[in-house]
């Protein structure tokens, strides 16, 4: 008869659900890489750029081996929500220099939103709590200059690229344990 009304439906095949999340993550990873390369071509980066408001990279030397699915999905969703906010901010406040990348940033935002919806669905199917971010959301002020927005874009795309790599590796690693 299925689960009682109002309770989350537990997926009959978590591997298939994970697969579809991995696919979207890999697609977004490819998009991010392409856009980061375009950014480097148009606005060459001088070294590493960082942005204090971005999430710290979830993966460190010891963490991948001890990952558990709830932790990965929760952390990934929280981090991607932060990156979504940053991409929205870039599109809104990036200034004229980033306007040339508007179609690509718009497509990236749409893919990010789609992946977040898929993660939300996966978490509800696995009956995992939809965790809220630990820290309060800090409002993002306008970039100090045109160069500031370019540096921010480099940092956002670079961080998202690494986060998505962590996600693909983590999700595929977990899939082998299911």
């Amino acid at each position: 008869p299925g689960p009682p009304a109002g309770s989350p439906r537990v997926s009959s095949d978590p591997r298939a659900d994970l697969d579809s999340a991995v696919l979207l993550t890999r697609s977004l990873l490819a998009d991010t890489r392409q856009l980061a390369a375009q950014m480097r071509d148009k606005f060459p980066a001088d070294g590493d750029h960082s942005l204090d408001s971005l999430p710290t990279l979830a993966m460190s030397a010891g963490t991948l081996g001890s990952l558990q699915l709830p932790g990965v999905l929760t952390r990934l969703r929280v981090d991607l929500m932060s990156y979504l906010r940053h991409v929205q901010w870039l599109r809104r406040a990036g200034g004229p220099s980033l306007k040339t990348l508007e179609p690509e940033l718009g497509a990236l935002q749409a893919r990010l939103e789609r992946l977040l919806r898929r993660l939300q669905l996966l978490m509800s199917r696995l009956a995992l709590p939809q965790a809220a971010p630990d820290q309060p959301v800090i409002p993002l002020g306008p970039p100090a200059s045109a160069w500031g927005s370019i540096r921010a874009a480099h940092a956002i795309l670079g961080g998202l690229h690494l986060t998505l790599d962590w996600a693909v590796r983590g999700l595929l690693l977990l899939k082998t344990r299911l």
Partner: antibody
Framework: EVQLVQSGAEVKKPGASVKISCKAS????????MDWVKQAPGQRLEWIGD????????IYNQKFTGRATLTVDKSASTAYMELSSLRSEDTAVYYC????????????WGQGTTVTVSS | DIVLTQSPASLALSPGERATLSCRAS??????????IHWYQQKPGQAPRLLIY???NLDSGVPARFSGSGSGTDFTLTISSLEEEDFATYYC?????????FGQGTKLEIK
């Protein structure tokens, strides 16, 4: 020119450990993962694991978990693979290879390091 | 783990001929438009060299006579007109899941 240069051949006794280095040049070291692949005589190529140089986070083929250890020295753009408790079946050529993030295809390879395990 | 089986194990052809190498996976390595199969060439005493990634994309610097096709479980590497330097061993590899695995290779020899 993008290059991966590996350390020289090693001869080891059973039970010993070996540590191979792989120096990257010609690209941004942290933009790609570093993968390690084994090629034993008459056997198919075998993926050992990979490491993200930005974070130092490795993942392993279950077959090598516990015996292989992957590390990086970001400042020297160098990756390392250590293999412990060596046995005769570990006699092989070991390659480091540059891996595309999230996709595991390898577009640049080191020249290979021959490891011979013999008593 | 996904097992890749390559056929034939060896193939003897002459320069100028067309070579067709096959790789079959024990389960599908394709999902929604992506096929996670890659092809490498290896010559004796050398490291493998990437030819084709994601089933049909030619790596930079690889001659256009090489092409890849297929989806699901069946994939093909085609060399349209063999040159002397193409005689080598060819491997397919998947990256659909962890761990990535390789086929046993097809040795392409001069007839």
């Amino acid at each position: 020119e993008v290059q991966l240069v590996q350390s020289g051949a090693e001869v080891k006794k059973p039970g010993a450990s070996v540590k191979i280095s792989c120096k990257a040049s010609g690209y941004t070291f942290t933009d790609y993962n570093m993968d390690w692949v084994k090629q034993a005589p008459g056997q198919r190529l075998e993926w050992i694991g990979d490491i993200n140089p930005h974070s130092g986070g490795p993942i392993y083929n279950q077959k090598f978990t516990g015996r292989a250890t992957l590390t990086v020295d970001k400042s020297a753009s160098t990756a390392y693979m250590e293999l412990s408790s060596l046995r005769s079946e570990d006699t092989a050529v070991y390659y480091c290879a540059r891996g595309e993030l999230g996709h595991w295809y390898f577009d640049v390879w080191g020249q290979g390091t021959t490891v011979t395990v013999s008593s | 783990d996904i097992v890749l089986t390559q056929s034939p194990a060896s193939l003897a052809l002459s320069p100028g001929e067309r070579a067709t190498l096959s790789c079959r996976a024990s389960k599908s390595v394709s999902t929604s438009g992506y096929s996670y199969i890659h092809w490498y060439q290896q010559k004796p005493g050398q490291a493998p060299r990437l030819l084709i990634y994601l089933a049909s994309n030619l790596d930079s610097g690889v001659p256009a006579r090489f092409s890849g096709s297929g989806s699901g479980t069946d994939f093909t590497l085609t060399i349209s007109s063999l040159e002397e330097e193409d005689f080598a061993t060819y491997y397919c590899q998947h990256s659909r899941d962890l761990p990535p695995t390789f086929g046993q290779g097809t040795k392409l020899e001069i007839k």
